[in-house]
């Protein structure tokens, strides 16, 4: 028999001129049909076809419905479950190949199986609870997995009907939190850490870059407690900004003015120094406050010298040498 | 500033219940674990238990599992202790305290007494 | 359960001298994990709660005048008040938080 419609709860179909040989040319239709609220579950038991000829199920009872599968060729023994109460089987058999190539055929058991489609219930998880998606587990619906806190989610926490009815994932389970979250890093400092996931007994030491000051315990370690998850000992601590005493201010040297002119001036800032017209600068016409325990002048305070100074002692040494005699023994002497 | 505010004195009969509030206030209330502990002149210092208000995980001291109760409520930053089947022996002084693995800040006491 | 065992369980001293008093535990505090003593010392003056003076043994509470010292380790704890003052009147206890949480009977501080 190369077609027809099978109305029974369970039966075999079988290839054309089974267990002989079927023939070329062939394009055969069975038609399943079981009880409304029931599906069909197809094994597959032998599958020896040539490599031109197909076999296809539809999930359905006509050709337009979803296709379950298509096979050519061998393959070993199989299953297939439909999502309603009909399936339709085509095999074509290709009209070219010589009847010497052709294999033995095929023997499909049907069965009418209760209707399920949907994949078996997820169970509650210690210490956790789970989220679906939609109220029916039918394919496609996702299903999250959550921990109650102080406990966190081992394996995948999210779930999803697959095709075949099966869950994408195993079953997720919650565990004791036994570590610290990460305390994060502090602003202007570096950490060191002493282990990667701050297990219990870890700790991180936070240390400030220059020129801050820490505020805060500078090493947390992770305790844990007796009713709560894991905790750090102390909050994370903060870098501040090194409030440095100011320099006090330098008079402005004699015939000279110094710029600005402030009596507190902060570590980190300059002063200038100029002199009035017909006076030169000895000294350094810039000196900075250096930030420190306590601030301090980078160098002294400058002065102010007359222009013309250095001409008048250079001329007055030779007259020095000029002097008038006092007594003959000076005389004698020069 | 951190505080831990206790509910009244309470005198109840033997075989009653109680319960006892603690609300607290200067502090987030859920960063830190909420305990009991009661003072009498026979047995000193008696922890009862503590409950992480973050979780509601809770844990007692095995002398007094089934006769106590603790809960919270996140809104009010409130911690609660009830305690059952009272008997003369439990007459004390409760403190709800807050710590981890210290008891860094302690209520204002609330004294129970049971007597018919 | 871990048993606290302090001593004395009272003792009377004059302002200014050096008080000492112990606190012993059943079992050892030291957690190698945290390398901590899961120990704490408690003021309770009359007609007080409890204060925290000191905790991982030996580490003064913000506010605790530096008179008051904690030391010891593992199952032997001290804590030390260098120069006794009025206020210092108190009734001491220790207390662990290793395992659950248990306290000392206390050392009862009276002044001369």
């Known amino acids: 028999v190369c077609s027809g419609e099978i109305t029974d709860s369970a039966g075999v179909v079988l290839s054309p001129n089974w267990p002989e040989p079927y023939g070329r040319g062939q394009d055969c239709i069975w038609g399943v049909h079981v009880e409304e609220d029931k599906r069909i579950m197809l094994d597959i038991r032998v599958l020896r076809i040539g490599p031109g000829d197909v076999l296809t199920f539809y999930d359905g009872d006509d050709l337009t419905a979803r296709v379950l599968g298509q096979y050519s060729g061998p393959r070993s023994h199989f299953k297939l479950f439909t999502s309603m109460a009909d399936v339709t089987i085509q095999f074509q058999s290709d009209p070219g190949t010589s009847v010497l190539g052709y294999q033995q055929g095929f023997v499909i058991h049907f069965f009418e199986v209760p209707r399920n489609d949907t994949c078996p219930e997820l169970p509650e998880i210690p210490n956790g609870w789970k989220s679906p998606s939609q109220p029916e587990l039918v394919h496609g619906t996702v299903v999250t997995y959550q921990c109650y806190p102080g406990y966190q989610v081992v394996g995948s926490s999210v779930l999803m009907c697959q095709w075949d009815l099966t869950w994408s994932e195993d079953l997720p389970s919650c565990q004791r939190v036994t570590s610290c979250h990460d305390p994060g890093d502090v602003e202007h400092s570096r950490r060191l850490i002493s282990s990667p996931k701050f297990p219990v007994g870890a700790t991180v030491q936070y240390i400030c870059d220059q020129g801050f000051v820490l505020m805060g315990s500078s090493i947390l370690t992770c305790h844990d407690r007796q009713a709560g998850s894991p905790k750090w000992s102390d909050r994370a601590p903060k870098c501040l900004l090194e409030q440095l005493k100011p320099c006090h201010g330098l008079s402005a040297p004699e015939n000279g003015a110094r710029s600005p002119e402030k009596q507190l001036h902060p570590a980190g800032a300059t002063i200038h120094f100029s002199c009035a017209p017909g006076y030169v600068l000895k000294g350094q016409a810039s000196i900075k406050c250096v930030p420190g325990h306590p601030s301090h002048w980078s160098d002294p305070p400058p002065i102010c010298r007359a222009a013309s100074l250095d001409g008048f002692y250079n001329s007055r040494s030779l007259d020095v040498a000029k002097a008038p005699a006092a007594s003959s023994t000076l005389d004698a002497a020069h | 500033q951190v505080q831990l505010q206790q509910s009244g004195a309470e005198l109840v009969r033997p075989g009653a219940s109680v319960t006892l509030s603690c609300k607290a206030s200067?502090?987030?209330?859920?960063?830190?674990?909420m305990h009991w502990v009661r003072q009498t002149p026979v047995h000193g210092l008696e922890w009862i238990g503590g409950?992480?208000?973050?979780?509601?995980?809770?844990v007692y001291n095995q002398k007094f599992k089934g006769k106590v109760t603790l809960t919270e409520d996140k809104s009010s930053s409130t911690a609660y202790m009830e305690f059952r089947s009272l008997t003369s022996e439990d007459s004390a002084v409760y403190y709800c305290?807050?710590?981890?693995?210290?008891?860094?800040?302690w209520g204002t006491g609330t004294t129970v007494t049971v007597s018919s | 359960d871990i048993v606290m065992s302090q001593s004395p369980s009272s003792q009377a001293v004059s302002v200014g001298e050096k008080v000492t008093m112990t606190c012993k535990s059943s079992?050892?505090?030291?957690?190698?994990?945290?390398?901590?003593?899961?120990l704490a010392w408690y003021q309770q003056k009359p007609g007080q709660s409890p204060k925290l003076l000191i905790y991982?043994?030996?580490t003064r509470e913000s506010g605790v005048p530096d008179r008051f010292t904690g030391s010891g380790s593992g199952a032997d704890f001290t804590l030390t008040i260098s120069s006794v003052q009025a206020e210092d009147l108190a009734v001491y206890y220790c207390?662990?938080?290793?395992?659950?949480?248990?306290f000392g009977s206390g050392t009862k501080l009276e002044i001369k």
């Open positions: 305290t807050r710590g981890d693995w210290y008891f860094d800040v």
């Open positions: 200067g502090y987030t209330f859920t960063d830190y674990e």
């Open positions: 207390g662990q938080s290793y395992n659950l949480f248990t």
């Open positions: 409950i992480d208000p973050e979780s509601d995980n809770t």
């Open positions: 991982w043994a030996s």
């Open positions: 079992q050892s505090l030291l957690n190698s994990r945290t390398r901590e003593n899961y």
